[in-house]
């Protein structure tokens, strides 16, 4: 059933991984770097999909993820045969207000304690991840192991 209450603005939050790296925008790419002084981590905009009835149940809360104030949203698309994470110029509220879920831009948000994971709705089994080395772009991965970090700490700002 469609959510009756329509939301006017997305929530805002900050994200870091278990190694205390934050997301930073660099040349239209999101990278994870250790937090330092005079650094500007991105503020995440997130909003739940209104059409949960048309999506798989029990995988998490389907959300759109964007960069607050920048009109950029995270999306998943295949490059060749490989699902990739991309930043696209898109208003997150335009996605929210559509009569259908926009799967390419949707992620199942699951929480376990303080840890959050973000699984692609368009490519089930693929998660937002960062390389354990750091200083690398965010990616999509199927490999939930030591090479990549898929657990993030999401702190809601308001």
């Amino acid at each position: 059933m469609e959510k009756a209450l329509k939301i006017d603005t997305p929530q805002q939050g900050s994200i870091q991984d278990i190694n205390h790296r934050v997301w930073v925008l660099q040349d239209q790419t999101l990278i994870a770097v250790p937090r330092k002084d005079r650094m500007s981590p991105v503020t995440i905009a997130l909003i739940s999909c209104r059409h949960v009835e048309t999506l798989e149940k029990d995988r998490g809360n389907p959300i759109y993820l964007g960069l607050n104030g920048l009109n950029l949203c995270l999306m998943c698309a295949k490059v060749g045969d490989q699902p990739t994470l991309q930043l696209k110029e898109k208003d997150i509220m335009d996605l929210y207000n559509q009569p259908e879920p926009v799967k390419s831009f949707l992620f199942y948000h699951s929480q376990s304690g303080r840890n959050s994971t973000f699984e692609s709705v368009a490519f089930p089994g693929w998660f937002i991840a960062v390389s354990s080395e750091g200083g690398c772009p965010l990616i999509l991965t199927q490999e939930l192991g030591k090479a990549n970090t898929t657990d993030f700490g999401l702190t809601m700002l308001f």
Epitope: L55, L95, Q98, P99
Partner: antibody
Framework: ELQLQESGPGLVKPSETLSLTCTVS??????????WGWIRQPPGKGLEWIGS???????YYLPSLKSRVTISVDTSKNQFSLKLSSVTAADTAVYYC???????????????WGQGTLVTVSS | ESVLTQPPSVSGAPGQRVTISCTGS?????????VHWYQQLPGTAPKLLIY???NRPSGVPDRFSGSKSGTSASLAITGLQAEDEADYYC???????????FGGGTKLTVL
């Protein structure tokens, strides 16, 4: 068996407002899973979705028509209605109402349809 | 011009097999949106024929089948019959247009 029936004037003058009503029988308009929609078909041409409404009153419109379209619902009468303002000859079409169904993982689809009503815009 | 592209017409003799294509783009069929098909007999309202690419509603003969690959979909009709003569429309959703979209329709003539 769910049935839909469109009603309203078949002739509307240019610049005026087209008004149509769809009466639903054989089922409730207040179901939690379905939307209700309007689609039109100009003579000899293809189909165009106009907009949809949920029984709570939540609406979605085709962006190119949004400034002229209003869809409303009356659950007590099991009806929903279409108003299209500032019409021109280009709005001449057969107007259909339909239930807008969903399935998990698929976009919504239209089933069943009303028989349709021809609306001509002419002075 | 329609967002989904269909051939204007196809034809076949009784008993033959015909296919109708529906070509979209990365913002509709290619964006994980399935395709539905409708049959419109002359002078009547459209009727749902296939939903979710390849599912038949009850009452639709198994002579009708659908498939989808990449940014395209197709409807196949086997054992063509005279009563299959109609217009056929594909439908999907386009997130760039924020709306449900139809193909331009294909007129099937049974020879």
């Amino acid at each position: 068996e769910l049935q839909l029936q469109e009603s309203g004037p078949g002739l509307v003058k240019p610049s005026e407002t087209l008004s149509l009503t769809c009466t639903v029988s054989g089922g409730s308009i207040s179901t939690s899973s379905d939307y209700w929609g309007w689609i039109r078909q100009p003579p000899g041409k293809g189909l165009e979705w106009i907009g949809s409404i949920y029984y709570t009153g939540n609406t979605y419109y085709l962006p190119s028509l949004k400034s002229r379209v209003t869809i409303s619902v009356d659950t007590s009468k099991n009806q929903f209605s279409l108003k299209l303002s500032s019409v021109t000859a280009a709005d001449t079409a057969v107007y259909y109402c339909s239930r807008v169904r969903y399935g998990v993982g698929v976009p919504r689809y239209f089933d069943p349809w009303g028989q349709g009503t021809l609306v001509t815009v002419s002075s | 011009e329609s967002v989904l592209t269909q051939p204007p017409s196809v034809s076949g003799a009784p008993g033959q097999r015909v296919t109708i294509s529906c070509t979209g783009s990365s913002s509709n069929i290619g964006a994980h949106y399935d395709v539905h098909w409708y049959q419109q007999l002359p002078g009547t309202a459209p009727k749902l024929l296939i939903y979710g690419n390849d599912n038949r509603p009850s009452g639709v003969p198994d002579r009708f089948s659908g498939s989808k690959s990449g940014t395209s979909a197709s409807l196949a009709i086997t054992g063509l019959q005279a009563e299959d003569e109609a217009d056929y429309y594909c439908q999907s959703y386009d997130y760039s247009l924020s709306g449900y979209v139809f193909g331009g329709g294909t007129k099937l003539t049974v020879l």
